[in-house]
Interface confidence: low
Amino acid sequence: GALEVQVPEDPVVALVGTDATLCCSFSPEPGFSLAQLNLIWQLTDTKQLVHSFAEGQDQGSAYANRTALFPDLLAQGNASLRLQRVRVADEGSFTCFVSIRDFGSAAVSLQVAAPYSKPSMTLEPNKDLRPGDTVTITCSSYQGYPEAEVFWQDGQGVPLTGNVTTSQMANEQGLFDVHSILRVVLGANGTYSCLVRNPVLQQDAHSSVTITPQRSPTGAVEVQVPEDPVVALVGTDATLRCSFSPEPGFSLAQLNLIWQLTDTKQLVHSFTEGRDQGSAYANRTALFPDLLAQGNASLRLQRVRVADEGSFTCFVSIRDFGSAAVSLQVAAPYSKPSMTLEPNKDLRPGDTVTITCSSYRGYPEAEVFWQDGQGVPLTGNVTTSQMANEQGLFDVHSVLRVVLGANGTYSCLVRNPVLQQDAHGSVTITGQPMTFPPEA
């Protein structure tokens, strides 16, 4: 005389944040009254109570106050449970246990799901790509559930399976962020597609990236520039070296040479149609016209300014083309520091004095070091400020606060990190009077 309890065979699929109904029904006999009904919903595995109806009354939710029965339908045998604001943690099996005179139970599965976002694609490296370069394409899709299936394919729809690494990470809500990384060697050009599939929702989210390297795989012009930055003093002239290897029979009529700022692509200087097109950069640039035919595409930059600092691209086109970027690092030496003392008279051991070390018109920002007469570094109570003027040159002011001993020497060293140039000043305080050492 067991009671027949019916639930759906297939799992109930519910989206995170929505409400789900776990259907459960029984067949009440004639004359059945709710006073006879004991209904218990529990988690199948742990037997944790979820919701119950007993002694003719809804006993309420024992599950985070997110469950409800359908009280008006109970008498007709509808024991279904409403679960509100579904979370990933709700996934699993729920048992519907019905007891009247006889009893019966059945379990229904809740499958939680969340759609994945449209994937975002990133490329590393993402510029100056050449056929033959190894690139890393990352496909990222967020806040889905359950774990995704990720597929990569090329522009012809051919699956790419080698050198793919996919990681999936759950957040506090249990939703997954998926990151899939494909490493490929570029051909002449190519499209790479990433498809993120939610296996429960059968929802596919795709994105693709098309990479067109800058040139064909063969016959590129090899452009050579120095690896290290070119260091130039403010106000002097700098040569940004760039060279290429001209083939036999090369003539300047074939040459297109463009110097531009790497970041902004602003034109700096060009040589096209067999002639020097001149400076497009404040009339402070020049080529070496007599050396061009031998493959010397270097650029002379006159009266260097702080604002010139940065990367310059040398772009050479004959039949094929190539380019390379050279960095210009601007520098200016710092002046010999001047030292001032506050207060500067009637000094006694135990007095607190403020020693200011000032050095002017340097670039880039300085490193400042203080030490005492024994060469011991002084780091406490030092405040250093650096202020750029309209030319971008820095004035540095470093303030040391010390308590005087019987006497003492305090040295300040202002270092230009690019020029590795050190400028020093020092002050010797001998109780009373105080002396500055003579200028070196």
Epitope: G132, T134, T136, T138, I181
Partner: antibody, heavy 117, light 112 residues
């Protein structure tokens, strides 16, 4: 200037494991690939595997799968190689080298591993 | 895996001579994109390897022009036009066309 510096020499017993480090400077660590290469005394070079720190992506030479585990710490610009179940065959100099799309352009000085009871 | 063979193990030379070091691969090193990823490294005693030539014939920055590389398919040669004392050491060829990357056994350039 790009620098690649490995950890110091190691003397370990057979069956033990060891973790070598490789600290780099003067380039964007996350966006480069670091490889490990093995060289037994008086012998050739064997590529072990590589790590791409941005996504902790690793690729291994099949011969070293299960033997070597590569990891990276982006905050310290350091790559690590964990070598397990050591035998005398693992005694070698291990180099860390930066992979520059086609080739290894900067190499560390090498770290000597001696496995001996 | 691709096997890189470098005969002979040792190549005795006189300073100022032309030295020629060969390398053969068990399969063509021409990638499907048309590029051949064959490189040469020099390892001096007690040092790490240093890149000399990449993609068959391209000199790496700072490498003197007395070094030149040539070859195609499976057969490659590194030439040193006038050997200097600082060129002595072990020369390795290496391929990065086929995964995993592999190296030759090395050829030791030493004085006669």
């Amino acid at each position: 200037e790009v620098q690649v510096v490995e950890s110091g020499p190691e003397l370990v017993k057979p069956g033990a494991s060891v973790k070598m480090s490789c600290k780099t400077s003067a380039y964007t660590f996350s966006d480069s690939v670091l490889s490990w290469v093995k060289q037994r005394t008086g012998q050739g070079l064997e590529w072990i595997g590589e790590i791409y720190p941005r996504g902790n992506v690793t690729h291994y030479n099949g011969k070293f799968k299960g033997k070597a585990t590569l990891t990276a710490d982006k905050s310290s610009n350091t790559a690590f190689m964990h070598f397990s179940s050591l035998t005398s065959e693992d005694s070698a100099v291990y180099f860390c080298a930066r992979w520059n799309n086609f080739f290894f352009d900067y190499w560390g000085q090498g770290s000597t591993l001696t496995v001996s009871s | 895996d691709i096997v890189m063979t470098q005969p002979p193990l040792s190549l005795p030379v006189t300073l100022g001579d032309l030295a020629s070091i060969s390398c053969r691969s068990s399969q063509s090193l021409v990638h499907s994109n048309g590029i051949t990823y064959l490189h040469w490294y020099l390892q001096k005693p007690g040092q790490s390897p240093k890149l000399l030539i990449y993609k068959v014939s391209n000199r790496f920055s700072g490498v003197p022009d007395r070094f030149s590389g040539s070859g195609s398919g499976t057969d490659f040669t590194l030439k040193i036009s006038r050997v200097e004392a600082e060129d002595l050491g072990v020369y390795f060829c290496s391929q990065s066309t086929h995964f995993p990357w592999t190296f030759g056994g090395g050829t030791k350039l030493e004085l006669k």
